[in-house]
Interface confidence: medium
């Protein structure tokens, strides 16, 4: 699947319900500039943070030219959900759509976009809009990847040994240390698709007094440091 094109700007804004909103939709100026390009870009990979609101858009076809809009939603382990709208009779029809968080943005005769409010881990999947017009069918698909921010903790568990954990992240976080030590990393996979990464490091060199755990993740990076004490130190914890 193609990566998001730079012309499809990812807009993030704070709304008064305190959830960030993400959209790959374009304004009218962008529609005219990118019309042919967007129709060619059939599929877009789109990482979206859990608990935000997401808006997925159909191809930029004027609604006056529309006959039918269909959204197909394929989520892991569920039957395909279809939401359709027929302009002439102003009818909508849904099949196998049980998740009430996935809805039309407004009335489909006014806005063909689909919204997820809020995004949950179960919304990982493929979303496709098909617009039927007198000129043919136009498609736009999204491979939606739900990102979950891991909870990061750092603590000393034995003499000159520290443990850094990135708990329940999606995808798995990467852990690095400054300075480098003698490290072992384990990953624990959870049924909901999240991964806990645990890195345990030991420093023999006694002139190392402070160590930093750096956690890299698609939702953002986080660094925590700890002083290596002769006895186990206080536990540090942070969200990315």
């Amino acid at each position: 699947a193609a990566q998001p094109n730079n012309s499809l700007m990812l807009q993030t804004s704070k709304e008064n319900h305190a959830l960030a909103s993400s959209s790959l939709c374009m304004d009218e100026k962008q529609i005219t500039q990118n019309y042919s390009k967007v129709l060619a870009e059939v599929n877009t990979s789109w990482p979206v943070k859990m608990a935000t609101n997401a808006v997925l858009c159909c191809p930029p076809i004027a609604l006056r030219n529309l006959i039918i809009i269909t959204w197909e939603i394929i989520l892991r382990g569920q039957p395909s959900c279809t939401k359709a709208y027929r302009k002439e009779t102003n009818e909508t029809k849904e099949t196998n759509c049980t998740d009430e968080r996935i809805t039309w943005v407004s009335r489909p005769d006014q806005n063909s976009d689909l919204q997820i409010r809020p995004v949950a881990i179960t919304h990982d999947g493929y979303y496709r809009c098909i617009m039927v017009t007198p000129d043919g069918n136009f498609h736009r698909g999204y491979h939606l990847q739900v990102l979950v921010t891991p909870e990061v903790t750092l603590f000393q568990n034995r003499n000159r040994t520290a443990v850094c954990k990135a708990v329940a992240g999606k995808p798995a976080a990467q852990i690095s240390w400054i300075p480098e030590g003698d490290c072992a990393t384990k990953q624990e996979y959870w049924s909901n698709g999240t991964v806990t990464v645990k890195s345990t490091c030991h420093w023999e060199v006694h002139n190392v007094s402070t160590v930093t755990c750096h956690v890299s993740h698609l939702t953002g990076n986080k660094s925590l440091y700890i002083e290596l004490l002769p006895v186990p130190g206080a536990k540090k914890s942070a969200k990315l």
Epitope: I68, T70, A84, T89, K93, T95, V132
Partner: antibody, heavy 122, light 107 residues
Framework: EVQLQQSGAEFVRPGASVKLSCTTS????????IHWVKQRPEQGLEWIGR????????KYAPKFQDKATITADTSSNTAYLQLSRLTSEDTAVYYC???????????????WGQGTSVTVSS | DVQITQSPSYLAASPGETITINCRAS??????LAWYQEKPGKTNKLLIY???TLQSGIPSRFSGSGSVTDFTLTISSLEPEDFAMYYC?????????FGGGTKLEIK
């Protein structure tokens, strides 16, 4: 194979009600729409209404709004037409038919039942 | 409601001939007109939808044309099994409405 099997002929008294059934096979009714059409003896076809079995939403022709009630049971793949306060004007053959719901093109009624004859007589 | 006027109401023809049946809508129905065949003892058959699209399994001697308000069903090289009742029907808006029907009989 797509089939719509309708219930048998009905002979009813004026003022009574009758409930006709349309059991489908070869497709899931919740994916489509089921329509009902009336045909009086030696006359043409009249559209009564339709149901979206997935959610129970119905639409009726104005003249049948107070006469007909369309329901569906997705577990048995069956649609129903209930006719109330029957008069001789309701003597007719009643057909159920399928309209494809979620397809790229909206079709009309692509499969029909064999019809149920309703005779209203005292 | 959209009124559908179908003509003629009766038509006599011989096998091998070509016939046309017309339907006129009281207002625009775009291309959303269907044609059906009704025969005693058989379930009604969809012949044409969207004005001109032949339904799967229907012989190519059946064809439909027209849009907006005026539509035509043409049956070329009539076969004995084509003698039946024919109805047009609009499905552009509710309530759906049918034409009065055309009875095609053998001359």
């Amino acid at each position: 194979e797509v089939q719509l099997q309708q219930s048998g002929a009905e002979f009813v008294r004026p003022g009574a009600s009758v409930k006709l059934s349309c059991t489908t096979s070869g497709f899931y009714i919740k994916d489509d729409y089921i329509h009902w059409v009336k045909q009086r003896p030696e006359q043409g076809l009249e559209w009564i209404g339709r149901i979206d079995p997935a959610n129970g939403n119905t639409k009726y022709a104005p003249k049948f709004q107070d006469k007909a009630t369309i329901t569906a049971d997705t577990s048995s793949n069956t649609a129903y037409l209930q006719l109330s306060r029957l008069t001789s004007e309701d003597t007719a053959v009643y057909y159920c038919a399928r309209q494809l719901g979620l397809r790229r093109t909206w079709y009309s009624l692509d499969y029909w039942g064999q019809g149920t004859s309703v005779t209203v007589s005292s | 409601d959209v009124q559908i006027t179908q003509s003629p109401s009766y038509l006599a023809a011989s096998p091998g001939e070509t016939i046309t049946i017309n339907c006129r809508a009281s207002k625009s129905i775009s291309k959303y007109l269907a044609w059906y065949q009704e025969k005693p003892g058989k379930t009604n058959k969809l012949l044409i939808y969207s004005g001109s699209t032949l339904q799967s399994g229907i012989p190519s001697r059946f064809s439909g044309s027209g849009s907006v308000t005026d539509f035509t069903l043409t049956i070329s090289s009539l076969e004995p099994e084509d003698f039946a009742m024919y109805y047009c029907q609009q499905y552009n808006e509710y309530p759906w409405t049918f034409g009065g029907g055309t009875k095609l009989e053998i001359k």
